[in-house]
């Protein structure tokens, strides 16, 4: 729970948050996600770095891998083979993009207490995983896929055409990693490890983004990434499946693409194994309002994969793009043909549907003016999912269980009343057959992780309650937080307001708007955070507000798809509308209002500053998009269509930050970007700066050499210190 407010007599013993607290991570919290290995066992890395097996039913635990072994290879991660004979140890972690990294892998034999020698793995490896049964290994090295039947065996090479920046096998290229798969891998074992499916991405024709990496050498390096910007040539994707028992027998077999998809540019969006001989692929047209789910079966006679048209399910949006941020993935039931899936109902709310034969005949499982967010697990008799139904707060997440064995199905909220004040935003992690599950509560109080019985939902034990954090916060004057809504012209604008500890409605406070605002995002969430804006409220006496306007998620399609083909309009309008409403509340100093955002938020903050309203005195844009023609095809076209004359070029041109350069004249603008940003290229800020210079508009800027979109490490400290000075100067607050 958030520490309760103390009486004034004790208030002088309490202190405000400092910027140092934030930068040092003094008030960070821990979560506990069990690494499940069966229905009732999980592994966890102890505080002293031993790998410990916990048995829930006996309450006992024992160490399977000592910290000495971990330390001998500097391991930072591990993975137990399903037959429990081997552990891979991961070291020399080297980050690439958001999810991808390379590493060195060692295989440790638990039965012998020694590392497997002979036929060692090459280094560095791009991805490695165990088969779901036994101890086969699949790995990607230099863009090719290899298979080992046993860790000590010589490898079998599955693909041979892998080439840096050209052909990617079993791993995604940049755009698929960031905007479609959201993983570092593009290979999938069948449930019993008989087959291995993988994607091949051909980037040969994709234009390359090139930027300098300055490093320490006399000459900078040039980083080249095949990166399709809006309207550019896209990767060509193919899906193959190989029999891992006899990999050399027929070799990889290509899975056919549905005809209605293959007729024009398309994407592969996900692969879900149903059984060892049935697989489900999802495809998406380049114009992302049509998605096809295709169920394919193995033909033993031909050793090929057959995807009959009768097993194609089409999902189409007439009001926006298909799905939310991504098209949802199916969760198959035990009959291995029917499945549960989240998509929009007739009222425009995302809900769980049960599909047995056709999408048209889908049975709606959940309904209401709220949204189902994630299906965690389907067992023989229960379906566990999360939603924001409870008490009609879109920024909450509770876990529900629907009994699917009985008719009509009964629904129970598992989490709604557990720790009602402390916990309103949950996720869950289930063991095999949902025998047990862990709940991880993210707030609004101090996060807590608990273990539960999957049949009774009874809490078994607390896994992590962040006691040290609770004690550390006892003498801290935390800001107050409130989540409320504004009703404006038939639109509901939810907002979170962070108020100084001694907030007094009769006084006037400077206001900082923190904005993200990207399609299908949500900023107003009931989660715990002690971060930079907490400090600004606690120590510097600012009011901070976050507003979820049009384009944001989990409140229905009307709000979500309002921005379709019109990015940069309504998101900005809604921030401005909210500011006007906040001024009307009477405690905002209307001469001291600022806005800041990062990434999409930098784009929105820039447009808000250049809106000509006179509302904002100053603002900050960190790594902003400045023109949608500069951003990735998969993301941009999903919401904007193509930048062509016969499609949506006009709005691409109208929605740039550069087109509004003149309007920055009457605001103080701080523009910040990392020079090695692989995601939102430095080009975006370079073009803003050029337009401002050409318009003879003064502004402030900061670049971070060799830093990417995250501005991590020492740059983080510099960044927040710099932004703090800028805001304090803007609000005339003494340093």
């Amino acid at each position: 729970l958030r520490p309760s407010r103390v009486h004034n007599s004790e208030e002088n013993t309490m202190r405000a948050l400092t910027l140092k607290d934030i930068l040092n991570g003094t008030f960070s919290y821990k979560t506990f996600f069990p690494n499940w290995i069966s229905g009732q066992e999980y592994l966890h890395q102890s505080a002293d770095n031993n790998i410990v097996l916990y048995n829930i039913e006996t309450g006992q635990s024992y160490t399977i891998l000592s910290n000495r072994t971990m330390k001998s290879v500097n391991a930072s991660n591990y993975g137990l083979s399903p037959d429990r004979q081997f552990v891979y140890l991961e070291s020399d972690y080297s980050k690439l993009w958001r999810y991808s990294y390379t590493a060195t892998y060692y295989i440790y034999d638990l039965s012998n207490g020694e590392f497997v020698r002979g036929n060692e793995l090459p280094r560095p490896i791009q991805y490695l995983c165990w088969s779901p049964v036994g101890s086969k290994l699949a790995y990607v090295y230099q863009n090719n896929i290899y298979l080992k039947q046993r860790p000590g065996d010589p490898p079998f090479q599955i693909t041979f055409n892998g080439r840096e920046n050209k052909i990617f096998n079993g791993i995604p290229d940049w755009v698929y990693e960031e905007e479609m798969l959201a993983t570092k891998y593009a290979l999938w074992w069948s449930p019993n490890g008989k087959f291995l499916a993988y994607a091949e991405f051909n980037d040969t024709d994709i234009p390359v983004i090139a930027y300098s990496y300055y490093g320490d050498e006399q000459y900078p390096r040039t980083i080249n990434i095949p990166y399709p910007k809006a309207g550019a040539k896209n990767p060509v994707v193919r899906i193959f499946i190989i029999d891992t028992t006899y990999p050399a027998y027929v070799g990889p077999q290509e899975v056919p693409v549905p005809a209605m998809i293959a007729s024009s540019d398309y994407y592969f969006s996900w692969l879900t194994w149903v059984t060892d001989e049935r697989v489900c692929l999802q495809w998406l047209k380049r114009v992302q309002n049509v998605s096809v789910l295709s169920i394919c079966d193995f033909r033993e006679d031909w050793q090929t994969w057959d995807c009959p048209k009768t097993q194609e399910h089409i999902e189409e949006s007439r009001t926006g793009w298909a799905g939310g941020f991504f098209v949802s993935t199916p969760v198959f039931s035990y009959d291995a043909i029917s499945y549960y899936k989240i998509f929009s109902d007739k009222d425009g709310y995302k809900h769980i549907h049960y599909i047995k034969d056709t999408v048209e005949n889908a049975i709606q499982i959940t309904s209401g003016k709220w949204e189902a967010i994630n299906i965690f697990r389907v067992t023989q008799d229960s379906l566990f999912y999360s939603s924001n139904e409870f008490e009609e707060y879109p920024g909450r997440r509770n876990i529900y269980r629907i009994s699917i064995g009985s008719y009509p199905p009964s629904k129970k909220c598992v989490t709604c009343h557990l720790r009602k004040e402390r916990c309103q935003y949950y996720t869950a992690s289930f063991s095999d057959y949902a025998k047990y599950y862990a709940l991880v509560c993210y707030g609004p109080g101090i996060p807590i992780s608990t273990l539960h019985d999957g049949r009774t939902d009874q809490e078994i034990k607390i896994l992590e309650e962040n006691k040290e954090l609770e004690n550390a916060l006892k003498n801290i004057q935390l800001p107050k937080e409130e989540i409320k809504k504004l009703e404006v012209d038939e639109i509901t604008l939810w907002y979170k307001m962070i108020l100084p500890p001694q907030f007094d409605r009769s006084k006037k406070y400077p206001l900082l708007i923190q904005v993200y605002g990207g399609p299908c995002s949500q900023s107003v969430r009931s989660v715990f955070a002690v971060n930079w804006i907490s400090y600004l409220a606690s120590k510097e006496g600012m009011v901070i507000a976050l507003v979820d306007g049009r384009g944001t998620a989990f409140q229905g399609d009307k709000l979500l798809y309002a921005v379709y083909r019109k990015l940069g309009v309504y998101e900005v309008e809604d921030q401005i509308t909210a500011v006007r409403k906040f001024i009307e509340m009477g405690f905002i100093d209307e001469k001291r209002i600022a806005i800041w955002g990062w990434s999409y938020g930098g784009y929105v903050s820039s447009l808000a500053l250049a809106s000509g309203t006179g509302l904002f005195k100053c603002g900050i844009a960190v790594a902003p998009v400045s023109s949608w023609e500069y951003y990735a095809s998969v993301y941009t076209e999903r919401f904007m269509g193509l930048p062509t004359k016969d499609d949506n070029l006009e709005h691409y041109k109208n929605s740039t930050v550069m087109a509004r350069a003149e309007y920055f004249r009457n605001v103080d603008y701080l523009l910040i970007h990392g020079t090695a940003d692989d995601n939102v290229h430095f080009q975006n800020s370079a073009q803003i700066a050029k337009a401002l210079v050409n318009a003879q508009v003064d502004f402030q800027a900061m670049w971070y050499s060799d830093q990417n979109h995250g501005l991590s490490g020492l740059s983080t400290n510099h960044l927040y210190t710099h932004m703090t000075h800028f805001l304090k100067q803007c609000f005339s607050l003494s340093d």
Epitope: S38, G39, Q40, E41, L53, N55, E57, T58, Q60, Y62, T63, I64, L65, S66, T69, L80, R84, Q85, L110, S111, G113
Partner: nanobody, 115 residues
Framework: QVQLQESGGGLVQAGGSLRLSCAVS????????MGWYRQAPGKRRELVAG???????TYADAVKGRFTISRDNAKNTLYLQMNSLKPEDTAVYYC?????????WGQGTQVTVSS
């Protein structure tokens, strides 16, 4: 303290059968995943069969269809029924938790299969 006592090994002709037993104390075997392991002369120890705390089992490819792992909950004992024995099954057989703890093994029981 966990104690594991293997027994039932011996000398047997190829094609013959043996039943190994493992008396378990210090833990309830039925509630723990247990395994039989073996180490042949000059070779590394390997998993022969694993039995989950439910009913899930795993067998090494070399013994599939010939060996059966089971337990008697009342006696807190783990068994390995070995049929159609081959000379290459000659080894010291151990029982342990599955996966094994990093620091404990019993004495084992010797199985020798003559041709």
């Amino acid at each position: 303290q966990v104690q594991l006592q293997e027994s039932g090994g011996g000398l047997v002709q190829a094609g013959g059968s043996l039943r190994l037993s493992c008396a378990v104390s210090g833990i309830i075997s039925s509630m723990n995943a247990m395994g039989w392991y073996r180490q042949a002369p000059g070779k590394r120890r390997e998993l022969v069969a694993g039995l989950g705390s439910g009913v899930s089992t795993t067998y090494a490819d070399a013994v599939k269809g010939r060996f059966t792992i089971s337990r008697d909950n009342a006696k807190n004992t783990l068994y390995l029924q070995m049929n159609s024995l081959k000379p290459e099954d000659t080894a010291v057989y151990y029982c342990n938790r599955w996966p094994p703890p990093y620091d404990y093994w019993g004495q084992g029981t010797q199985v020798t299969v003559s041709s």
